[in-house]
């Protein structure tokens, strides 16, 4: 069982390989000096049907380096960064893992592209392994919370409340969604 030629890459090179390309072979992509690699650099020859070989993912791309590009802090609810730190320049990558009791959907790594957006795939999502969710928390007068546009929330996540200037937060600032589907505290209030 073998794979066909690896997908080509513009403005870059593919690591050395011999043919036929055996299942288990890894090929690696790199870009010319003025270009930045966007996407996973390593492709693996696998077989899904024990008959034909196929590459396990699409090839990355080489983008012309844009020194003005910068990407915003990527947020994955229920997840955390295991690699990557601000500032995020063109070609920088961030890798995520999920918190305990969350499982990942999608690709764990994303790259800062020339268009100031993370890619080439969407940010991963971390899905709660618990079926229970906490109901949406109410807004508070003269205050805000971090999940204004989110409905129900998965266990393990938290909501942070804050007050407008001139108001004092009374109660818990951070409320956690418990595995029971209940919140760890009642919402606080904002008092003058």
């Amino acid at each position: 069982i073998s794979c066909g030629s690896p997908p080509p890459i513009l403005n870059g090179r593919i690591s050395y390989y011999s043919t036929p390309i055996a299942v288990g072979t890894v090929i690696r992509y790199s870009c010319s000096g003025t270009f930045r690699l966007i996407g996973e650099k390593s492709l693996l020859c696998i077989t899904k049907d024990k008959v034909d070989g196929t590459w396990d993912k699409p090839a990355p791309k080489c983008e012309y380096f844009n020194k003005y590009s910068s990407c915003p802090e990527p947020i994955v609810p229920g997840g955390y960064k295991i690699r990557g730190s601000t500032p995020y320049r063109h070609g920088d990558s961030v890798t995520f893992a999920c918190k305990t009791n969350f499982s990942m959907n999608g690709n764990k790594s994303v790259w800062c592209q020339a268009n100031n957006m993370w890619g080439p795939t969407r940010l991963p999502t971390c899905v709660s392994v618990f079926p229970l969710e906490c109901p949406a928390l109410p807004m508070i007068h003269n205050g805000h919370h971090t999940s204004e546009n989110v409905g129900s929330i998965a266990p393990g996540l938290s909501v942070t409340y804050s007050c407008e200037s001139g108001y004092l937060l009374v109660g818990e600032k951070i409320i956690n969604c418990l595995s029971s589907g209940k919140w760890s505290a009642v919402p606080p209030t904002c008092e003058e």
Epitope: S15, Y16, S18, V23, V26, R28, S42
Partner: antibody, heavy 119, light 106 residues
Framework: QVQLVQSGAEVKKPGSSVKVSCKAS????????ISWVRQAPGQGLEWMGR????????NYAQKFQGRVTITADKSTSTAYMELSSLRSEDTAVYYC????????????WGQGTLVTVSS | EIVMTQSPATLSVSPGERATLSCRAG??????LAWYQQKPGQAPRLLIY???TRATGIPARFSGSGSGTEFTLTISSLQSEDFAVYYC????????FGQGTKLEIK
């Protein structure tokens, strides 16, 4: 960090086989590849082969092709290396080493297993 | 197999001084090179990967450079714990190691 714990030292007769185990703890066994690297006394490091446990795919260095078999048991997070038709030149410390995904470099190593081949 | 050649075989340097170790690949390997440190009776330890990226927990005095066929590991100010054997390893095409450089106290 992933810990790799290998089986104990072995003394073998020429012509026989040896099977060394490498148990991983921490991390996800299915998300990495395990290589076997050996080091003869006072010598350098020599790559023998590697397995990607989630796929069950093993590949071998040409020098060891037909004489080495690398397997993995996902249920126990353990990789195995069996070397057959042993000769005195196979006396070495055998290491298992882990590469995250298919990065190509080894973040974690087992403590090594000394295999002595002697009549 | 890509042949990796390290030089010198033995390097004698005084503590506090700078050490420069070389590794040459038999063919172009881009930046697919790692450096390891090995002390007697121990397994190797990853220092540098992708030719110049320090592994987690490795002190800043260790730095790697080079691409293509010529690579260098530099230890800026040698500490007593740095005297060991150093290996380079390529992962452009499967895997192979250099024969090692022994760094000893002068």
């Amino acid at each position: 960090q992933v810990q790799l714990v290998q089986s104990g030292a072995e003394v073998k007769k020429p012509g026989s086989s040896v099977k060394v185990s490498c148990k991983a703890s921490g991390g996800t066994f299915s998300s990495y590849a395990i290589s076997w690297v050996r080091q003869a006394p006072g010598q350098g490091l020599e790559w023998m082969g590697r397995i990607i446990p989630i796929l069950g795919i093993a590949n071998y260095a040409q020098k060891f092709q037909g004489r080495v078999t690398i397997t993995a048991d996902k249920s126990t997070s353990t990789a195995y290396m069996e070397l057959s038709s042993l000769r005195s030149e196979d006396t070495a410390v055998y290491y298992c080493a882990r590469e995250e995904d298919i990065s190509g470099y080894y973040q974690d190593w087992g403590q090594g297993t000394l295999v002595t081949v002697s009549s | 197999e890509i042949v990796m050649t390290q030089s010198p075989a033995t390097l004698s340097v005084s503590p506090g001084e700078r050490a420069t170790l070389s590794c040459r690949a038999g063919q172009k390997i881009s930046s697919y090179l790692a450096w390891y440190q090995q002390k007697p009776g121990q397994a190797p330890r990853l220092l540098i990967y992708d030719a110049s990226t320090r592994a987690t927990g490795i002190p800043a005095r260790f730095s790697g450079s080079g691409s293509g066929t010529e690579f260098t590991l530099t230890i800026s100010s040698l500490q007593s714990e740095d005297f060991a054997v150093y290996y380079c390893q390529q992962y452009e095409y499967w895997y192979s190691f250099g024969q090692g450089t022994k760094l000893e106290i002068k």
